[in-house]
């Protein structure tokens, strides 16, 4: 039996889009199906359709096809956003160039090479002919458009409206002439969909006939649209996987653009390793801002919309996501991939005319020897020799004094989060410095994340009396109040310290907050005897990108039957998959008559790979995140629970393994929760507790 060809490669996909017909005369046809491929096959073959199919929409929610005799360029039609819809348009009808002899060309050019208007195919005036639309079904002999129904040598042609000229070819360019690229085409985002030998490209979102790793959702910045040629991996030029099972991949024939956009006057001196002047000529590949946050691609509008695109600034080399200075700013910069931080300067790039020492660090920066002497919050570092006593207090070996010169940022204690320094400010004894890891350095700061090498529990003593959970064993749960209302959860990890989330502090005025401990009811009803209300004296923000905050209480909590601390895990530990854990919170429950009592949801630990699959590959987890899925569909953390803990038990010991942070949806069915991995930040937490002064009880 002949294998039916998969025709979805012949369509251009527009995700989350549908077409709405404004003209009621336009027909559509619908049917329930399982996949978009089925819709495509039927559209291509026009099987059972009362019109020539030019596009279709696949409704993922209803598993339904909507076939159209029109596309987004047709009149009487408008595009509309819709989460559940994907629009597929037959490329032949929207392409304005030809492939090979142009047999598949179905565009709307209707003028010949010498400028004569074409005669309609259904007309016999001025020229009689046998090319009737009814005789050439599927060849789209519509209106008076140029066509090549027999695949003849000269390309698309038509009978002309001039009685003296029977027929003439049309001047439609080859797609390979229209398409062009700059450099090696890493930033090429054109519509070439066949290789240099004419093989049709395989869709990037398909795994047949060739399995591959370049999934569009895993690499959203690589432009993996439909089956267009791309260069995601630094090849000499764009390429694609092919539909030929015997040819895995092939290069595409895309010519280099004739670059006449460069203005010879006022061209800045190009540098790759350092900045000259304001860095307008910097052409290096640093692609993070000063604090290590990766840059957004210049050709992307997510997470930040902007007009600094390669198209608008052609001679500014806005490739990939490299730091550049296209607008005369004070130094190279970029939009960041952090939705909360729009732009940042790449101030870690050294100045050409100023030996600045190293301006980035490798691994965790313990060998960093640069000259930076300022913290991320702008405080000037204080001299190491004035702080040796404090340093000895929290490290158990003799630091290398030869490295601790002046007041430069260093990492004498093997801190996982990079170089730091003392500040001389009694409120902020030390902080991290705004230096990022060296470009290309991928050394993990914790190894073997998915292998349970280090146990998370410190000891093996029994923690729950007789194994009966009572009210007292949630004594570490904190209700953070903002202007007298519950806003977030938190975990009491030491008498004076609460671990919570950065987003829980809308105001910078600490008088707006207080911490309630020892309560079961969010309003404190019936908890009068056990409730402790404490003011907040300081917020210590976690390492860049952590979303963590250590909240210092104005006085230590009194530990009793109702208030207790919860243990931290060992640094870098891994909890085994399927370990049963719980999240606690006073947040949104989905119930109208919520009683205000502390709730618990039971989750189980899921490996990062598996977790990513459950998120349909849209989320790549890193070593600072931990994932847990619900045992009960649709249960999990939500608004009001943020800052609260993911608590797991190992060797009969309960620990806070994760912190609930916003941004991952609210208890979405079949989507496991992603939490901040406390084990990754455990050393930072211990260091803060050890070095920051707290009031005595």
């Amino acid at each position: 039996q002949r294998k039916r060809r998969n025709t979805i490669h012949e369509f251009k996909k527009s995700a989350k889009t549908t077409l709405i017909k404004i003209d009621p005369a336009l027909k559509i046809k619908t049917k329930k199906v399982n996949t978009a491929d089925q819709c495509a096959n039927r559209c291509t073959r026009n099987k059972g359709l009362p019109f020539t199919c030019k596009a279709f929409v696949f409704d993922k929610a209803r598993k339904q096809c909507l076939w159209f005799p029109f596309n987004s360029m047709s009149s009487g039609v408008k595009k509309e956003f819709g989460h559940e819809f994907d629009l597929y348009e037959n490329k032949d009808y929207i392409r304005n160039c030809i492939i090979g002899k142009g047999r598949s060309y179905k565009g709307t050019v209707s003028i010949t090479k010498s400028g004569i208007k074409c005669q309609p195919w259904s007309s016999m005036i001025p020229h009689e002919h046998s090319f009737l639309p009814s005789s050439y079904r599927g060849k789209d002999l519509q209106e008076n458009y140029c066509r090549n129904p027999r695949g003849e040598e000269g390309g698309p042609w038509c009978f002309t409206s001039n009685p003296e000229v029977r027929y003439e070819v049309c001047d439609i360019p080859q797609c390979s002439e229209v398409e062009c690229m700059t450099c090696n085409g890493e930033s090429y985002r054109g519509l070439m969909d066949h290789t240099e030998s004419g093989k049709i490209c395989q869709r990037w979102d398909h795994q047949t006939p060739h399995r591959h790793k370049f999934l569009p959702e895993r690499y959203p910045d690589k432009g993996f649209d439909d089956n267009y040629c791309r260069n995601p991996d630094g090849q000499p030029r764009p390429w694609c996987y092919t539909l030929d099972p015997h040819t895995r991949w092939e290069y595409c024939a895309i010519k280099t653009c004739a670059d006449n956009t460069m203005n010879d006057t006022d061209v800045p001196l190009e540098t790759t390793e350092c900045i000259q002047g304001q860095g307008e000529g910097y052409r290096g590949t640093v692609n993070t801002i000063w604090n290590g946050i990766p840059c957004q691609r210049w050709d992307s509008q997510y997470p930040h919309e902007h007009d600094m695109t390669p198209e608008n600034f052609k001679c500014k080399d806005l490739r990939e996501n490299y730091c550049r200075n296209p607008d005369g700013s004070e130094s190279p910069w970029c939009f960041t991939t952090d939705p909360n931080i729009r732009v940042g300067y790449c101030s870690q790039i050294p100045n050409c005319d100023m030996s600045h020492g190293q301006d980035c660090y490798r691994g965790n920066g313990k060998n960093y020897m640069g000259n930076l002497s300022q913290t991320r919050s702008g405080l000037t570092c204080s001299m190491w020799d004035k702080n040796m006593e404090d340093l000895h207090r929290h490290i158990f070996w003799e630091p290398d004094a030869s490295k601790l010169n002046e007041n430069y940022c260093r990492n004498p204690d093997d801190d996982a989060h990079g170089p730091w320094c003392y500040t001389g400010n009694p409120l902020i004894p030390w902080d991290y410095c705004p230096i990022s890891r060296c470009e290309g350095d991928t050394t993990p700061t914790i190894v073997n994340l998915d292998h349970p090498v280090i146990s998370c529990a410190k000891t093996k003593q029994l923690r729950v009396v007789n194994g009966i959970p009572t009210r007292t064993n949630i004594g570490w749960m904190v209700s953070l109040r903002y202007r007298n209302k519950h806003i977030c959860g938190g975990s009491l990890i030491k008498e004076s310290w609460v671990l919570t989330a950065r987003q829980c502090f809308p105001s910078r005025d600490l008088k707006d907050y207080e911490a309630w401990l020892g309560i079961h009811d969010v309003h404190g009803r019936g908890d009068e005897k056990c409730k402790q209300v404490l003011n907040v004296s300081q917020l210590v923000y976690g390492p860049e990108g952590s979303d963590l905050v250590l909240m210092k209480l104005a006085r230590p909590a009194v530990l009793d039957d109702f208030v207790s601390t919860i243990d931290l895990p060992n640094y870098g530990c891994t909890i085994p998959e399927k370990t049963s854990c719980s999240v606690y919170g006073w947040g949104y429950t989905g119930l109208i008559n919520y009683d205000g009592l502390l709730r618990v949801a039971h989750l189980y630990i899921m490996g990062n790979e598996k977790c990513s699959q459950h998120h349909r590959g849209k989320v790549t987890l890193n070593e600072s995140e931990i994932c847990a899925g619900a045992e009960k569909i649709g249960s999990g953390p939500c608004e009001g629970d943020y800052g609260g803990p993911l608590v797991c038990e190992q060797h009969k010991m309960r620990m806070v393994l994760g912190v609930i942070v916003p941004g991952r949806g609210c208890a979405i069915p079949n989507r496991p929760g992603i939490f901040v991995r406390v084990a990754y930040y455990a050393k930072w937490i211990h260091k803060i507790i050890l070095t920051y002064k707290v009031p005595q009880s």
Epitope: Y302, Q503, P506, R508, D509, D512, G663
Partner: antibody, heavy 115, light 110 residues
């Protein structure tokens, strides 16, 4: 981008809901705010909704307005408008998940309250 | 409350001149202050944030300074395009705030 809608001519006391539709960024990363401007007057901050779902209102706006959100929209409900509520209402994105400056504004939607 | 007072309400300046606008907070807001420019029929445009940081695409003739309770916006080498109303906004806290914005300063360019 952000775009306001729902502004129209209403009579005093007729409830009105203004909607701010966002695209190109996620409401799980940014706080959102409503600001208004009466004809020939200055900017007047009304309310903010933070990433964690908490809300804040200007002291004069408490009880007079309600801010809420879905995954892609932020609403401002005016349960009982008065003639003093005639203004252009702007939706603005806060440059953070918490209170900060506004780095993205909508074009505004005009509300006219008149009997 | 963290309320903002802006002065003057209006100022006239010649092309090429310098204009100074002041903004006072009712209590200390550290450096959490932003400045906006608004032209008729348009939404406000961010100029300065964190008291002195220039927003992307804003010309360097705009300069912000100050901390605590006293802040200043200075426009030097004024151009015709700078004719607009300027507002300050505190980005510190909205606890019991009447208005996060100052009353505005109209800059008229002669």
């Amino acid at each position: 981008s952000v775009e306001e809608s729902g502004g129209r001519l209403v009579t005093p006391g007729t409830p009105l809901t203004l909607t701010c539709t966002v695209s190109g960024f996620s409401l799980s990363a940014y706080a959102m705010s409503w600001v208004r401007q009466a004809p020939e007057k200055g900017l007047e901050w009304i309310a903010v909704i933070y990433v964690i779902g908490a809300t804040d209102y200007a002291s004069w706006a408490k009880g007079r307005f309600t801010i809420s959100r879905t995954s892609t929209t932020v609403d401002l409900r005016i349960p009982s408008p008065t003639t003093e509520d005639t203004a252009t209402y702007f939706c603005a994105r806060v440059y953070d998940s918490v209170w900060n400056h506004f780095n993205l504004w909508g074009p505004g939607t005009l509300v006219t309250v008149s009997s | 409350a963290y309320d903002m007072t802006q002065t003057p309400a209006s100022v006239e300046v010649a092309v090429g001149g310098t204009v100074t606008i002041k903004c006072q907070a009712s209590q200390s807001i550290s450096s959490w202050l932003a400045w906006y420019q608004q032209k008729p029929g348009q939404p406000p445009k961010l100029l300065i944030y964190q008291a002195s940081k220039l927003a992307s695409g804003v010309p360097s003739r705009f300069k912000g300074s100050g901390s605590g309770t006293e802040f200043t916006l200075t426009i030097s080498g004024v151009e015709c395009a700078d004719a607009a109303t300027y507002y300050c906004q505190q980005a510190y806290s909205v606890s019991n705030v009447d208005n996060a914005f100052g009353g505005g300063t109209e800059v008229v360019v002669k």
